[in-house]
């Protein structure tokens, strides 16, 4: 018989797989229909009747073609340090991303398990490497001739202004102060900022220590306290 003529359930020919969007039911020993995303198997197939599918209930989902008896629970609501970038629907789990000024310190299969605030470099230190969705800011001491007088996760070290006559020499955390005669060269007013990382990757997190009821193939890794990097300050 030409392929895809038999209706489910049917016994496959020896050595043959089931067809598209079908599964082999070991109990019935038949090829049966899978349930589409957004549904689950309410009644499994038998030798004479196909799978009966039903829609997922509120706050549950199935993302794949399946024959699971129950839909998966959507993850818990996004925490205050996150933004919901994908709502929980019958076909997809909720996805949360870290809000601006935060990064994903511990990711999971789809999204983020734990957001943390981006490190702020204290005066005397500037941003050596800006934060990203998944990495913290790296601070570095301002080199001679440069300074940073802010506590910031975006400001880099800026050159001291050059004075005709120096009133107070600059240091790592303070600009040079010139005498009343104007400096020969001055940086543009205002701090130099690095752009904030933009979160585009799908992320989802659990804001509370309690495990979500949603099964996950990723593992919760232990995360001990980490010492602050030199020149950084906690929030």
């Amino acid at each position: 018989l030409p392929a895809q003529v038999a209706f489910t359930p049917y016994a496959p020919e020896p050595g043959s797989t089931c067809r598209l969007r079908e599964y082999y039911d070991q109990t019935a020993q038949m090829c049966c229909s899978k349930c589409s995303p957004g549904q689950h198997a309410k009644v499994f197939c038998t030798k004479t009747s196909d799978t009966v599918c039903d829609s997922c209930e509120d706050s549950t989902y199935t993302q794949l073609w399946n024959w699971v008896p129950e839909c998966l629970s959507c993850g818990s609501r996004c925490s205050s340090d996150q933004v919901e970038t994908q709502a929980c629907t019958r076909e997809q789990n909720r996805i949360c991303t870290c809000r601006p000024g935060w990064y994903c310190a511990l990711s999971k299969q789809e999204g983020c398990r734990l957001c943390a605030p981006l490190r702020k470099c204290r005066p005397g230190f500037g941003v050596a490497r800006p934060g990203t969705e998944t990495s913290d800011v790296v601070c570095k001491p301002c080199a001679p001739g440069t300074f940073s007088n802010t506590t910031s996760s975006t400001d880099i070290c800026r050159p001291h202004q050059i004075c005709n006559v120096v009133a107070i020499p600059g240091n790592a955390s303070m600009d040079a102060v010139c005498t009343s005669t104007s400096p020969t060269r001055s940086m543009a007013p205002g701090a130099v900022h690095l752009p904030q990382p933009v979160s585009t990757r799908s992320q989802h997190t659990q804001p509370t220590p309690e495990p979500s009821t949603a099964p996950s193939t990723s593992f919760l890794l232990p995360m001990g306290p980490s010492p602050p990097a030199e020149g950084s300050t906690g929030d």
Epitope: Q4, P12, G15, T17, R19, L20, K34, W65
Partner: antibody, heavy 119, light 107 residues
Framework: QVQLVQSGAEVKKPGASVKLSCKAS????????INWVRQAPGQGLEWIGW????????QFNENFKGKATMTVDESTSTAYMEVRSLRSDDTAVYYC????????????WGQGTTVTVSS | DIQMTQSPSSLSASVGDRVTITCQAS??????LNWYQQKPGKAPKLLIY???KLETGVPSRFSGSGSGTDFTFTISSLQPEDIATYYC?????????FGGGTKLEIK
Amino acid sequence: QVQLVQSGAEVKKPGASVKLSCKASGYTFITYDINWVRQAPGQGLEWIGWIYPRDGNTQFNENFKGKATMTVDESTSTAYMEVRSLRSDDTAVYYCARGDRDYGYFDVWGQGTTVTVSS
Amino acid sequence: DIQMTQSPSSLSASVGDRVTITCQASQDISNYLNWYQQKPGKAPKLLIYFKSKLETGVPSRFSGSGSGTDFTFTISSLQPEDIATYYCQQGNTLPLTFGGGTKLEIK
């Protein structure tokens, strides 16, 4: 990274057989179908069939039943396809491709093996 | 078997142009329509599956639409690296079948 690497080009005489190989790496070999697709010179693509490495079961395009045999060696993550009774119109590039049986697509392809059938 | 008819079979366009290719199935295939790009001497590459889902890593200038029997593949702004042959393929019913291809050239 996920890849499929195929064996080298073959030149065969009409009536002969050829056995092509496709070695998978970068993913769990037994969880995805390996499909075979061929492309005659200057022509389009033609699906031959798939094999499910977990149990070795297959699904064929009717046009290739009795013409092609698909097997796997789970220990080396390699799929094979033998094509028998070769004719000049079997001259083609033969591709292996990882398939998705829910949406019917091929997301990872081998580089192809050129089979030339000539007397 | 389901026949897939692609049109045009070839087309020429300029960099920056919006390019549209159509694919017609001989019977209803729901949304089970996939699109591939094939460059000379290379294997096909999956661009779009299930009518409009973009494969990971594929630029957003590629898109797909349609349903039932009539489908459209669009490149919103043609880039030099898009020169290739494009194939549609139905994933609804066995045997899996491909369109005849559309060869895209730069004007």
